[in-house]
């Protein structure tokens, strides 16, 4: 693994993809989605220590300023670098339609 | 302002663009950048309450699951939606060069 992918806090503690099992009710979708009834939601969770999966120059700056001024500048945070599309069968005024969402499930993660 | 832009926590508490004055030393750039000597770093800071500047469907999901499982799923976090480019005069082995960085200064912010 690249240096930027080795978590100094211990395995699984740093920014990475997690899967959370959720029902339509959990997601607040019960009133407008018919299928799926449950979703394996992939999302980015974990700490962003120095140099870990830094997305860009901005993330480097943010980390340096966070170390200097931790009360003013937060540490970078773990967010999706890209997404996997997902199709939903959703209720409409007249019935149902299929809609693909490109920004629903995280595919991989980085620190920004 | 749209509902998603009105901060329920009070003015200036939610995710927005902040400017932090930083020297080359602060940024850890003193050994490779000549100019500028100081930077007005724009970055995204602030809380991401429900429905505030949600970047996409994923952010909505994350907030709903955070309310259900706050110990497992973190709230969405405030990150750049886009960047402003910045030019640096940087030291090279033979002298100096000008380099434009597209991902250095946050231009606007959203919650992911």
């Amino acid at each position: 693994a690249r240096n930027g992918d080795r978590c100094p806090l211990g395995p699984g503690r740093c920014c990475r993809l997690h899967t959370v099992h959720a029902s339509l009710e959990d997601l607040g979708w019960a009133d407008w989605v018919l299928s799926p009834r449950e979703v394996q939601v992939t999302m980015c969770i974990g700490a962003c220590p120095s140099q870990f999966r830094e997305a860009n120059m901005h993330a480097q700056i943010k980390m340096n300023l966070h170390r200097l001024k931790p009360d003013t500048v937060p540490a970078p945070c773990c967010v999706p670098a890209s997404y996997n599309p997902m199709v939903l069968i959703q209720k409409t005024d007249t019935g149902v339609s299929l809609q693909t969402y490109d920004d629903l499930l995280a595919k991989d993660c980085h620190c920004v | 302002a749209r509902n998603g832009d009105r901060c329920p926590l009070g003015p200036g508490r939610c995710c927005r663009l902040h400017t932090v004055h930083a020297s080359l030393e602060d940024l850890g750039w003193a050994d490779w950048v000549l100019s500028p000597r100081e930077v007005q770093v724009t970055m995204c800071i602030g809380a991401c309450p429900s429905q505030f500047r949600e970047a996409n469907m994923h952010a909505q999901i994350k907030m709903n699951l955070h309310r259900l499982k706050p110990d497992t799923v973190p709230a969405p976090c405030c990150v750049p939606a886009s960047y402003n480019p910045m030019v640096l005069i940087q030291k090279t082995d033979t002298g100096v060069s000008l380099q434009t960085y597209d991902d250095l200064l946050a231009k606007d912010c959203h919650c992911v």
Epitope: P36, N84, P85, M86, I89 | -
Partner: antibody, heavy 118, light 107 residues
Framework: QVTLKESGPGILKPSQTLSLTCSFS??????????VGWIRQPSGKGLEWLAH???????YYNPSLKSHLTISKDTSRNQVFLMITSVDTADTATYYC??????????WGQGTTLTVSS | DIVMTQAQNFMSTSVGDRVSVTCKAS??????VAWYQQKPGQSPKALIY???YRYSGVPDRFTGSGSGTDFTLTISNVQSDDLADYFC?????????FGGGTKLEIK
Amino acid sequence: QVTLKESGPGILKPSQTLSLTCSFSGFSLSTSGMGVGWIRQPSGKGLEWLAHIWWNDDKYYNPSLKSHLTISKDTSRNQVFLMITSVDTADTATYYCARGAYDFFDYWGQGTTLTVSS
Amino acid sequence: DIVMTQAQNFMSTSVGDRVSVTCKASQNVDTNVAWYQQKPGQSPKALIYSASYRYSGVPDRFTGSGSGTDFTLTISNVQSDDLADYFCQQYNTYPYTFGGGTKLEIK
């Protein structure tokens, strides 16, 4: 615009292997929740579901035919394949592929006709 | 396997009439039933999902109802263009199974 099109040999002899291809456009099998199924219909008769493949490569088969069926996909080329080994005259039918998101076949191909005859 | 029975193989109706096509499941399938229309010489087209939800673009003359084991597709104000076979399908459990179909004839 979603389209699916089946292609096959048209005529086979008993005991031969049937290879069918479903070429589609307008959607991707890398999309979570998306699938493609194969359904057949003997002339003048009802519909019989054969197999289904999902975005995550999960595969389901009709138990009555499972030992003869293999479904696969090439996600990058937008194609799904069905292989039926050891065909018989009872396999004479029109074979359809259909987009099946969450078990709902909302778009169907035009069908390809197979005749099994010695 | 779950058997889907469409008791009527043929139904005859007139333009403007209302007709109901029925489908019975051999065991409880909740509302996990779809309906398809197949016009002569064509491939099937989706009409109804989850027993009662019209698929986008389907005229509101088509209405689905039922849950458990008994399901109905109702066509009101029948048009000559509705001449077709109508199939129910359960997707509650594998294998997916279809009814034998009901052919709608226009007098």
